[in-house]
Interface confidence: low
């Protein structure tokens, strides 16, 4: 009869953590008679995984009925795999003997790799908005991966960031690992459309890294600039005063007109125009009837943006000037809302 060979047809098996690994082993002959044992590792320090003849191995089941004399399939399944199970498994045929069976021939070994994918990275930014030129911190977390080796990169609009700190926990052996990274980002006025990306590369992802993103639109506040201008209107004794609110983000904005310190009208930004950089512009106007006033009028455009302290810009209407040229006083016609397209 042909010499017995112990065939482990799979050089390697890749199993996800928590699943069952099937390790295949067959013999080419029924003789010599004797049991099979499975070991992890080779040499004197090898670890017994399964003994056909004796012992209790609750995580191990055999593929075939090893009690049948004509069985030549010594494959096993190991349940609930963890990364600690990684290693090379040898199927070893023993020659029956007394008092001990004698090792006869070993299979070539099957390398079991246990891999768990990292979870999708979650990127979180600061709790409160910040203005340009400020530095804000973003965190990125991903969990449940194995092996421990992992690469994390940060990008802002495709440009790699360098100011970040990363930790992989735990430091020692574990079933799975987590990564936590904090990156510092300096905001600019152009960052409304910007994105911060955390990219995680791991052996389980086969060169296709996972990405988590955060939009800086959730983080940035660009305060508005104000400009108050006066324009004559065709009608006698009327002056149109406009307040240009430029380059602000987010849209949440309330504008109040004051005449000599007294509230004349309050309105909320609604129909805004969007700039290419994602910021907004808005304009409010006030139609002023100057004929009823002898004294100069101080008009103030006061803007409260995104819950921040109000900013304002004032404009003096000179009553002495000819109405058609400059306009003068302010029995302001507070008639309704801002109709932007009046001129």
């Amino acid at each position: 009869e042909e010499e017995l060979q112990v065939i482990q047809p799979d050089k390697s098996v890749l199993v996800a953590a928590g699943e069952t690994a099937t390790l295949r082993c067959t013999a080419t002959s029924l003789i010599p008679v004797g049991p099979i044992q499975w070991f992890r590792g080779a040499g004197p320090g090898r670890e017994l995984i399964y003994n056909q003849k004796e012992g209790h191995f609750p995580r191990v089941t055999t593929v075939s009925d090893l009690t049948k004399r004509n069985n030549m399939d010594f494959s096993i399944r190991i349940g609930n795999i963890t990364p600690a199970d990684a290693g090379t498994y040898y199927c070893v045929k023993f020659r029956k003997g007394s008092p001990d069976d004698v090792e006869f021939k070993s299979g070539a070994g099957t390398e079991l790799s246990v891999r768990a994918k990292p979870s999708a990275p979650v990127v979180s930014g600061p709790a409160a908005r910040a203005t340009p030129q400020h530095t804000v911190s973003f965190t990125c977390e991903s969990h449940g991966f194995s092996p421990r080796d992992i690469t994390l990169k940060w990008f802002k609009n495709g440009n790699e960031l360098s100011d970040f700190q990363t930790n992989v926990d735990p430091v020692g052996e574990s079933v799975s690992y987590s990564i936590h990274s904090t990156a510092k980002v300096v905001l600019t006025r152009e960052d409304v459309h910007s994105q911060v990306i955390c990219e995680v590369a791991h052996v389980t992802l086969q060169g296709d890294p996972l990405r988590g993103t955060a939009n800086l639109s959730e983080t940035i506040r660009v305060p508005p600039t104000l400009e108050v201008t006066q324009q004559p209107v065709r009608a006698e004794n009327q002056v149109n005063v406009t307040c240009q609110v430029r380059k602000f983000y987010p849209q949440r904005l309330q504008l109040t007109w004051l005449e000599n310190g007294n509230v004349s009208r309050t309105e909320t930004a609604s129909t805004v125009t969007e700039n290419k950089d994602g910021t907004y512009n808005w304009m409010s106007w006030l139609l002023v009837n100057v004929s009823a006033h002898r004294d100069d009028v101080k008009l103030t455009c006061q803007v409260e943006h995104d819950g921040q302290p109000a900013v304002s810009k004032s404009h003096d209407l000179k009553v002495s000037a000819h109405p058609k040229e400059q306009g003068s006083n302010t029995a302001a016609e507070n008639t309704g809302s801002n109709e932007r397209n009046i001129y």
């Epitope: 047809p9 996800a16 030549m72 399939d73």
Partner: antibody, heavy 120, light 107 residues
């Protein structure tokens, strides 16, 4: 090129046995698993088992363990499947299949199939 | 053993159409799924293995996708030679088991 040659037809009586062959050529016979598949008339494919010619190692689906015996003859690069205690339920086309992917459970090359008729 | 459930059992379509056949495994088989085509009176032919890899010589109008327990085979722009029976088969064995098949007929 890889080829698997099977006899076109076998006719046997109920209760008898049949040993059908699958002759391989065009590749290293002992390096790749050979799988056997059953297809009853108008029905789907049913995996019976496979054998590793390099070792004679076999796998069977449970329902065929007592029905089908898989063997190989490496000297003639031929795989055999013996079906025992035949009944009309065993009337079917039997395919052998192999290929470079056979270790990984897919089969690139198929024989033409042997039509087995069990009839008295 | 892992059971494979294929749907639909039968499908009629016209030349030029796009069709999708699905296959469900009774347990996680990762990406270890193959697809075969079989024409009347002929042997099966491998189309796709490991869920999405096209076998040699298979036209690019065929594409496989899926992982875990849910898989599909998509055929774009059906050609007359595409009509026949299609089978999925899990590779996560042995034993390996086939789906019950999908018959693709000309409308």
């Amino acid at each position: 090129q890889v080829q698997l040659q099977q006899p076109g037809a076998e006719r046997v009586k109920p209760g008898a046995s049949v040993k059908m062959s699958c002759k391989a050529s065009g590749y290293t016979f002992t390096s790749y698993w050979i799988t056997w598949v059953k297809q009853r008339p108008g029905q789907g494919l049913e995996w019976i088992g496979d054998i590793y010619p390099g070792s004679g190692s076999t796998n069977h689906i449970e329902k065929f363990k007592s029905k089908a015996t898989l063997t190989v003859d490496t000297s003639s690069n031929t795989a055999y499947m013996q079906l025992s205690r035949l009944t009309s339920e065993d009337s079917a086309v039997y395919y052998c299949a192999t290929g470079y992917g056979s270790s990984y459970g897919y089969f690139d090359y198929w024989g033409q199939g042997t039509t087995l008729t069990v009839s008295s | 053993d892992i059971q494979m459930t294929q749907s639909p059992a039968s499908l009629s379509a016209s030349v030029g159409e796009t069709v999708t056949i699905t296959c469900r495994a009774s347990e996680n088989i990762y990406s270890y799924l193959a697809w075969y085509q079989q024409k009347q009176g002929k042997s099966p032919q491998l189309l796709v293995y490991t869920a999405k890899t096209l076998a040699e010589g298979v036209p690019s109008r065929f594409s496989g996708s899926g992982s875990g327990t849910q898989f599909s085979l998509k055929i774009n722009s059906l050609q007359p030679e595409d009509f026949g029976n299609y089978y999925c088969q899990h590779q996560y064995g042995p034993p390996f088991t086939f789906g019950s098949g999908t018959r693709l007929v000309i409308k």
